[in-house]
């Protein structure tokens, strides 16, 4: 960067090199060039010469003033016009940054995705700071008082093997940058209460041609958790509103859920589960599409990625898989 150049003088910023966005700042340049009494001192921002708000303070020093500085980053350097020198002589340069102190981190959430071997902690960092902001995640055992700290710039994955202070912990997040430090409230967790079961997946769908046509959705999870509650939501692709069905589930076998749907309409399905009575849900599964037939039965398999129609009794209507419309992976 600009900071690594050889200087023939000194450049500095008031109030500081990193300052709050929107502040008035002054950049000072002091020449110390052998055999040179500068005729003029020039300031450059990102390589472009500044024309205004420059004040000569004395023979060797000048000041550049900015009102309401809003750029997150800028490279500044200054030069001198020396007598008998054809070109300007470089004095020094500095990278400057503006931004905001961190907000108080909130919505601290820690979950253990089954089989992951990690506790994943996330939080809402608040408004963009524009400058380098680090987060320290504190994990303190309520049983031993031992505390571990983890430095990160976003979320953190903590190996459950490293959580050796029992099952109950406090977790909080400290946010810090050059302009300030804030700290979240403390979240109390029990490791057994924050496990999210292995993802539930819809594998196929079929519509059985009966007096009243019936659609069966087949879905499964690799979870070893015994008591699991699930929700399946579905809607016609043309609708905005979801219908939700709730299930108490035992994943010792593939689940089959029955729906009575309108004929000749494309539907979308999603499923999510949680350990019964616990706090956190899985994110909703990928969108699974199934078009109900006009009269003939239809099977939809996740293996195919586009719509195909066969002649004969079994009709395959194929899901397009991973659209993201209203597919928020919320765990709350």
């Amino acid at each position: 960067g600009i900071t690594n150049i050889n200087c023939s003088g000194h450049i500095w910023v008031e109030p500081a090199t990193i300052f709050k966005m929107g502040m008035n700042i002054s950049i000072y340049c002091q020449a110390a060039i052998k055999n040179c009494q500068p005729r003029k001192l020039h300031f450059y921002k990102n390589g472009i010469k500044e024309r205004f708000q420059i004040t000569r303070i004395n023979k060797t020093t000048a000041r550049l003033w900015y009102k309401n500085f809003l750029e997150p980053h800028a490279s500044m350097y200054c030069t001198a016009e020396c007598p008998k020198h054809f070109q300007e002589t470089l004095i020094c340069g500095k990278d400057i940054s503006s931004g905001y102190p961190p907000d108080i981190p909130d919505e601290v959430t820690c979950v253990i995705y089954e089989y992951s071997g990690n506790m994943t902690c996330t939080w809402n960092a608040g408004k963009l700071t524009y400058i380098d902001t680090k987060y320290v995640v504190h994990v303190k055992s309520l049983e031993t008082e031992e505390e571990q700290q983890y430095l990160t710039s976003s979320y953190i994955n903590i190996s459950t093997d490293s959580l050796q202070g029992g099952k109950k912990y406090l977790v909080w997040v400290q946010a810090a940058n050059a302009l300030g430090m804030e700290e979240s409230k403390q979240l109390q967790i029990h490791l057994d209460d924050i496990v999210i079961p292995s993802a539930a997946v819809i594998s196929r769908a079929e519509t059985i041609n009966a007096t009243v046509p019936k659609t069966i959705i087949y879905w499964d999870s690799q979870t070893t958790i015994e008591k699991v509650s699930c929700e399946m939501r579905y809607k016609a692709t043309t609708n905005q509103t979801w219908n939700v069905k709730e299930f108490d589930t035992n994943f010792t076998y593939v689940q089959q859920s029955e729906f009575y749907l309108e004929p000749n309409i494309k539907y979308v399905f999603q499923v999510r589960c949680q350990e019964t009575g616990k706090r956190y849900w899985q994110p909703w599964s990928s969108l699974f599409f199934h078009k109900t037939p006009e009269t003939v039965p239809q099977v939809t398999s996740k293996a195919f990625q586009h719509d195909t129609w066969n002649s004969g009794l079994t009709v395959a209507s194929i899901s397009t898989g991973h659209l993201t419309s209203d597919n928020r992976g919320d765990i709350g």
Epitope: L142, E145, W172, M181, E183
Partner: antibody, heavy 121, light 112 residues
Framework: EVQLVESGGGLVQPGGSLRLSCAAS?????????MCWVRQAPGKGLEWVSC?????????YYANWAKGRFTISRDNSKNTLYLQMNSLRAEDTAVYYC????????????WGQGTLVTVSS | DIQMTQSPSSLSASVGDRVTITCQAS??????LAWYQQKPGKAPKLLIY???KLAAGVPSRFSGSGSGTDFTLTISSLQPEDFATYYC??????????????FGQGTKVEIK
């Protein structure tokens, strides 16, 4: 057994500086731990000054009144904790103790003998 | 800023008395509280940690209780060597940006 020995106290003029040291033995410096400074003005109660957390990273904490004037640091190669005190005032006169449990808890099983800092003209 | 309020500031008692000292935190500190004993010219000595756990080598006449914001140190039968000053300390977190002190003001136990 953890042992803590403070040094560096003495008489200093207002506005002056002093660096206190705390030589530690018996602590596993490869594990996570807190080490702290606590002071006690003559005839007064205990007052927390600062702590340093050492683990996969280093974090420092200060009492509100100590921020900007006092700096805690440590040299793992010398097993020593430091407290750099600048812009000293008469009200900083106290016995300064180094304290730890040798682990990442904030109660203190082990205390040094204390070192007296006197700020006076 | 978590404030620790200890009471009483001093008390007079006789050998054999049951003595109770209380400490109140301005916010929930769970069970993260320690008690210390200090004698003149000496460094403090840890008595109780995690609100109720007895530190190594501390006589069983000392006990601690409480959680959340209200805590108690009890000496079941005061002995001559127990005349000293006692301090509580919150051991929850010091990372909070505005902490002035983590100790209570102290309770001096004197001979009646």
């Amino acid at each position: 057994e953890v042992q803590l020995v403070e040094s560096g106290g003495g008489l200093v003029q207002p506005g002056g500086s002093l660096r206190l040291s705390c030589a530690a033995s018996g602590i596993d410096f490869n594990s996570n731990y807190y080490m702290c400074w606590v002071r006690q003005a003559p005839g007064k109660g205990l007052e927390w000054v600062s702590c340093i957390y050492v683990g996969s990273h280093v974090n420092t904490y200060y009492a509100n009144w100590a921020k900007g004037r006092f700096t805690i640091s440590r040299d793992n190669s010398k097993n020593t904790l430091y407290l750099q005190m600048n812009s000293l005032r008469a009200e900083d006169t106290a016995v300064y103790y180094c304290a730890t449990s040798g682990s990442s808890v904030l109660y203190f099983k082990f205390w040094g003998q204390g070192t007296l800092v006197t700020v006076s003209s | 800023d978590i404030q620790m309020t200890q009471s009483p500031s001093s008390l007079s008692a006789s050998v054999g008395d049951r003595v109770t000292i209380t400490c109140q935190a301005s916010e929930n500190i769970y069970s993260f509280l320690a008690w210390y004993q200090q004698k003149p010219g000496k460094a403090p000595k840890l008595l109780i940690y995690s609100a109720s756990k007895l530190a190594a080598g501390v006589p069983s006449r000392f006990s601690g209780s409480g959680s959340g914001t209200d805590f108690t140190l009890t000496i079941s039968s005061l002995q001559p060597e127990d005349f000293a000053t006692y301090y509580c300390q919150q051991t929850n977190r010091y990372s909070n940006p505005d902490i002035y002190n983590v100790f209570g003001q102290g309770t001096k136990v004197e001979i009646k």
